[in-house]
Amino acid sequence: KSPIFGPQEVSSIEGDSVSITCYYPDTSVNRHTRKYWCRQGASGMCTTLISSNGYLSKEYSGRANLINFPENNTFVINIEQLTQDDTGSYKCGLGTSNRGLSFDVSLEVSQVPELPSDTHVYTKDIGRNVTIECPFKRENAPSKKSLCKKTNQSCELVIDSTEKVNPSYIGRAKLFMKGTDLTVFYVNISHLTHNDAGLYICQAGEGPSADKKNVDLQVLAPEPELLYKDLRSSVTFECDLGREVANEAKYLCRMNKETCDVIINTLGKRDPDFEGRILITPKDDNGRFSVLITGLRKEDAGHYQCGAHSSGLPQEGWPIQTWQLFVNEESTIPNRRSVVKGVTGGSVAIACPYNPKESSSLKYWCRWEGDGNGHCPVLVGTQAQVQEEYEGRLALFDQPGNGTYTVILNQLTTEDAGFYWCLTNGDSRWRTTIELQVAEATREPNLEVTPQNATAVLGETFTVSCHYPCKFYSQEKYWCKWSNKGCHILPSHDEGARQSSVSCDQSSQLVSMTLNPVSKEDEGWYWCGVKQGQTYGETTAIYIAVEERTRGSSHVNPTDANARAKVALEEEVVDSSISEKENKAIPNPGPFANEREIQNVGDQAQENRASGDAGSADGQSRSSSSKHHHHHH
């Protein structure tokens, strides 16, 4: 008994297509070994026609394919444009040779059934319409015209020229003539269903002088397109239903027993299982639209159908398109957290995966909005400036080459809760969905900046300090100046890290940034953050305002008289003298875009090199001014 299983007999007619599924036992070896389809000859030899190694015989060229579905333990052989020559005995099997595990399949391709010699064949898809042409002689012009459908014994009227219409064709059948041509009448039947298939007779006149024509109407279910997608990836259903339904509501549904459950439609209906990960996009005025689903799950596999109807629901006799979606669990897309939790006032760092082979692709982050058909406006991207309402609190850090980019959002509010998508302009399968949950903060933030009301005075020295808890002791600390093109990392000094003591004093862990002398360009948002290698952690933000010195008063930096802040301020300040020229934009910076800046700060350079520059959104390394300094020992 063969462990391979499939259809023992497959029968079809010329010109048709078959899709033969072969099942194999669930083992790792079976999933990865060669799959083949071969034809048995009289000698008992089995000649390969197609295999999963890429082999395709000449007689199958352009009309066959073989797809392995390892997660289902099946493989499918699709063969199109069948001829009677394809009739024969075949094997589907597994193994390096055609003597491996196999299953015998008999394929029989028949001639198209014989019909009366004058029969005209119309082949239409479900939901479409057909116009049947019925010629007649001039002498029958005044006579009654009709179309009837053949049943076992009789011919049941569909429509006639006296406006009699069969109840099941009311609103669907029209009998008409075109122009002044008195030798042909037409019958149009719209919203075709499977039940409309069969033999029809159109007739003009009565008795022996009547003109008759035989018509064979074939109504086909659409062949489902096979889609093979990875777990956590995305799929796009491209639906092209034709101009006649351009103004109807569109839907995508999933087959469930006899019904098709609507997942999304253009009337605002959406299945809660797809919340945050689905969009429906009308493409044009020709009835084309697409549905994008991201973050594919195992349970998303199944039989999908798109269609159009004013109700936004599946309706018999309306055009449809179908797909069979398989979700492969052996995914190339890394398993990342699909839910990220933050607290009000805090921050989140979201690691977005992308295809590592496309490190130069443009990266984006968008917020999924469920209203209407759903849309995902871009909030930030490698060449897209941060949206205004996210000023000072959103940045994208690209880490070229490692298959991940990071999006940081701070100053969180409960309004930020929702679904966000990571996407690139490259491989669309790598679109991923993140749900951000924001809870009310119940404790002080981990990172705190002093002074909190930061106003720097033009021409003076100004220092801000970022206090961090001992749990961040071993992580890199950084300051960066935010712009709508990213957050450019600045030289800074970690006061806690230089203490030789093994114990960690909670009150003296701080990282400082000094502006000396303060210039007008220094005004703006600054972030203090922690990171470990390329993994970004928490951040906090502060806005530094710059104002002119009030005349006649000697100004003291507003340090809130905070002793911890003074630790940094008491250190000697060394001018790093970076020229403006050196600090201009660097295209596509590496992880150390500000390396020259770091090297110029003397013997602190080595310690800080690791924190590098995460690379601002489009690689522009604009610093707040050219006068950032380091505390130096």
């Epitope: 023992q8 007999e9 497959v10 007619i13 048709d16 499977h194 279910a221 027993k257």
Partner: nanobody, 127 residues
Amino acid sequence: EVQLVESGGGLVQAGDSLRLSCAASGRTGSSGAMGWFRQGPGKEREFVAALMWRNTVTYKYYEDSVKGRFTISRDNAKNTAYLQMNSLKPEDTAVYYCAADPDTYGDPRNSGAYDYWGQGTLVTVSS
């Protein structure tokens, strides 16, 4: 909703033939699947044969022990599936169930792939 009614069961001698019918009320479309399963005394329900169709293409599946003896077929116009059983053996004794599904996906041997079931018809093969 599809209703399935089996008929044709009965008591026969080993080596005899029987033809089971499964009439489906309700609409069967241009694609679908119908299968026959059986449950012998004190045994699990097992796959016997199945027929899947999509437009003009038909796929027939058989369990190894019935290959060459049983034939599954369908009359499209009558919405009926048949199981022609020849060379019957005592081990074929069982209640035979007809199953149907409007979809043509999934392993036809898997009873979970079918949404609609008949009440069953008893076939007894005496030696």
